[in-house]
């Protein structure tokens, strides 16, 4: 007689990340029996929702589900049936929701009351939607990484299972780079935490760690851009900018109503007597990343140490893993590579920063262009923001790993979320008591 | 700016197999679906099947599963529809299609302007 | 498969009018609190437009006087008042299920 295989005992969780620029669904597997475990929760898939971010639809919210719709039927195909009911269901909202929450709550709440009932409509376990802190945002993303890394395993291993793992149990840094912040996360060096604001503590899996975490609103790439923009065109002697951020002969017509529509810009807003201005790129590195630095207030400090804008950042300790944006971006410029140092990205910026917008359509063909004619500001962004805001060094260039994903599970805070409102992070070792959520807030 | 470029008329003998393209340009083909329908001559419009580029997850009328496969090409921003074992009946217009929302959050549908395909001996 | 049905099968209308075309479907095409059903025009010799998804969306582009409602089976495409430009073959296509399906088409006509 043959062998009948056991069913499966597996549990399976779906978090949706609705960011500012689109959103992402992401379906997670486990074994029932070892939940407590860690490292064995992974990814099956990543279905990317078709169209922008959620905070778009805020004139057309009656479409949300429709917009929702094909993802969420790609879940319900890749997750048994007679697992439908015990899935959980959770969407966590980030900074295009707190943007969109800062102009109007009213507006916010409305497109989270529908998104909660459009997902209520289906065969799963919804647990809810919420806009998600930018604290929160950035320690689901160390403890997303740091949990596929291994690092809260107390098993010392003589094999690395990992890319980037060393045998030490110090943890990675996080770094995140999103549309419309960006987070960075890690353990300083027995160094105070200076503001409260920033410290996190945790006990995970026994052990305990104080985590320095801090958000960046507005200093995520979409909204860096728009932020660079309106300050430039401050200066503009007329319709015409001239913007080194974009490649030779490239030309865009902006509207000035979209340049001030965010809150990012606020602090730029002023009467200008056109209605329409047109970029005109002239590609020079250089050029763009004095600009970009502009955007950082770095003459104000009232901590021993500051990232910018008056924002306390201990001294950067460890390997940090750089993922989203940070790698979507180097990964398009083919500058991941642990071997390339940071003199060598900043020659490659340089180069493709001047080569011809002609020339790039041609040899990009199936990128969209809005996406394409935007590399170059994001590449020279992610150098400043790392080296001038964050205050990496050449030297320390080498610790940054830009990372999409580890085992098979994209890095970012999904993962990090659904453990914690799973309760599959323990304070102890198991068997004992899961964290509570509270501890994060 | 969006245009999706179809090749050209095709004339094949049945039981032939032929690949048609769908070349898309001001527009990356792995934000949306790619849907490919048909139009017998006089008759009207049937849905063939659908793909998305960005994990080359395909959708087929199960009439056409096996026979026909749709394919995409990211590096080229191109979708193919491959026919095989063709019959008479076969013979059609066949159209690629994108819709779906924008960066803005507009619903949006592109065409492209249709290939005959001819099965004859 | 979901079959849809459409009526007319043709419609003559004199311009400034309003037309109404029917589309019955075999079985529900709501879903999650949604009807997946589309409306498209074609006219000779061009690919087919988007006027209507989701049972009442209107297409980028499509002129107000382009109009759908209804839920479950039961489903129609008005137009408010007829321009020239409007006498086409209308189609209507449920995207609930696999084989999305359209109806047999509605020739309006120049009265």
């Known amino acids: 007689t043959q062998n009948k295989a056991l069913p499966e005992n597996v549990k399976y969780g779906i978090v949706l990340d609705a960011g500012s620029s689109h959103t992402s669904l992401y379906i997670y597997k486990w074994p029932a029996e070892k939940e407590n475990d860690t490292g064995v929760v992974h990814q099956v898939e990543e279905c990317r929702v078709k169209g922008p971010g959620i905070s778009k639809f805020v004139q057309k919210v009656n479409e949300i589900g429709i917009y929702l719709t094909d993802c969420m039927e790609r879940a319900r195909e890749v997750i048994p049936r007679s697992q439908h009911q015990e899935t959980p269901v959770y969407l966590g909202a980030t900074a295009g929701m707190r943007l969109l929450r800062m102009e109007s709550e009213e507006l916010a709440d409305r497109v989270l009351d529908v998104v909660e009932r459009s997902l209520s409509n289906y065969p799963f376990d919804f647990q809810g939607a919420r806009i998600i802190t930018g604290q929160e945002e950035g320690a689901y993303g160390w403890i997303t990484i740091n949990y596929l890394l291994g690092k809260f395993s107390q098993k010392t291993r003589w094999f690395s299972i990992v890319p980037y793992e060393t045998n030490n149990q110090e943890t990675f840094g996080a770094l995140d780079l999103g549309g419309a912040s960006t987070q960075v996360t890690f353990v300083p060096q027995n160094q105070t935490i200076e503001s409260p604001d920033n410290a996190l503590q945790f006990r995970l899996y026994g052990k305990d760690y104080n985590v320095y975490t801090h958000s960046f609103l507005c200093y995520g790439k979409d909204q860096a851009l728009w932020q660079k923009l309106a300050k430039d065109i401050q200066v503009a002697s007329n319709e015409i900018l001239r913007d080194p951020c974009f490649h030779p002969g490239y030309k865009k017509v902006v509207n000035v109503s979209d340049l001030y529509k965010t809150p990012c810009t606020k602090r730029f807003e002023m009467t200008l007597p056109f209605q329409q201005f047109e970029i005109q790129g002239i590609g020079n590195y250089q050029q763009c990343h004095q600009s970009i630095l502009e955007l950082f207030n770095t003459s104000y400090c009232p901590y021993s140490q500051c990232a910018f804008n008056g924002i306390f950042l201990p001294p950067l300790q460890g390997d940090f893993g750089a993922f989203s944006a940070f790698y979507f971006v180097m990964k398009f410029l083919n500058l991941t590579s642990e071997k390339v140092s940071q003199e060598k990205v900043t020659e490659m910026m340089k180069k493709f920063c001047a080569q011809p917008w002609e020339e790039i359509k041609t040899s990009y063909a199936g990128v969209k262009e809005k996406y394409l004619s935007e590399y170059c500001f994001s590449g020279t962004y992610i150098l400043s923001l790392l080296l001038q805001g964050y205050h990496f060094t050449a030297d320390s260039w080498e610790h940054i790993h830009f990372i999409g994903k580890i085992q098979g599970s994209d890095a970012g805070w999904t993962l990090g979320y659904m453990l914690n409102l799973t309760n599959m992070i323990p304070a102890e070792q198991p068997l004992s008591t899961p964290l509570s959520h509270s501890t994060y807030v | 700016q969006v245009q999706l470029v179809q090749s050209g008329a095709e004339l094949v003998k049945p039981g032939a197999s032929v690949k048609l393209s769908c070349a898309a340009s001001?527009?990356?083909?792995?934000?949306?679906?790619v849907h490919w329908v048909r139009q017998a001559p006089g008759k009207g419009l049937e849905w063939v099947g659908k793909?998305?580029?960005?994990?080359?997850?395909?959708k087929f009328d199960p009439k056409f599963q096996g026979r026909f496969t749709i394919t995409a090409d990211t590096s080229k921003n191109t979708a193919y529809l491959q026919l095989s074992s063709l019959r008479s009946e076969d013979t059609a217009v066949y159209y690629c299609?994108?819709?779906?929302?924008?960066?803005?959050?507009?619903?949006?549908?592109?065409w492209g302007q249709g290939t005959l395909v001819t099965v004859s001996s | 498969d979901i079959v849809l049905t459409q009526s007319p099968a043709s419609l003559s209308v004199s311009p400034g009018d309003r037309a109404t075309i029917s589309c019955r479907a075999s079985?529900?095409?709501?879903?999650?609190?949604?009807?997946?059903m589309n409306w498209f025009q074609q006219k000779p010799g061009q690919a087919p437009k988007l006027l209507i998804y989701?049972?009442?969306n209107q297409g980028s582009g499509v002129p107000a006087r382009f109009s759908g409602s209804g839920s479950g089976t039961d489903f129609t495409l008005t137009i408010s008042s007829l321009e020239p430009e409007d006498f086409a073959v209308y189609y209507c296509?449920?995207?609930?299920?696999?084989?999305?399906?359209f109806g047999q088409g509605t020739k309006l006509e120049i009265k």
């Open positions: 793909i998305d580029p960005a994990n080359v997850n395909t």
């Open positions: 989701a049972a009442s």
């Open positions: 001001g527009f990356s083909i792995k934000d949306t679906y």
């Open positions: 079985e529900s095409v709501d879903n999650y609190g949604i009807s997946f």
């Open positions: 296509q449920q995207s609930k299920e696999v084989p999305y399906t």
């Open positions: 299609a994108l819709y779906g929302y924008d960066d803005d959050a507009y619903y949006f549908d592109y």
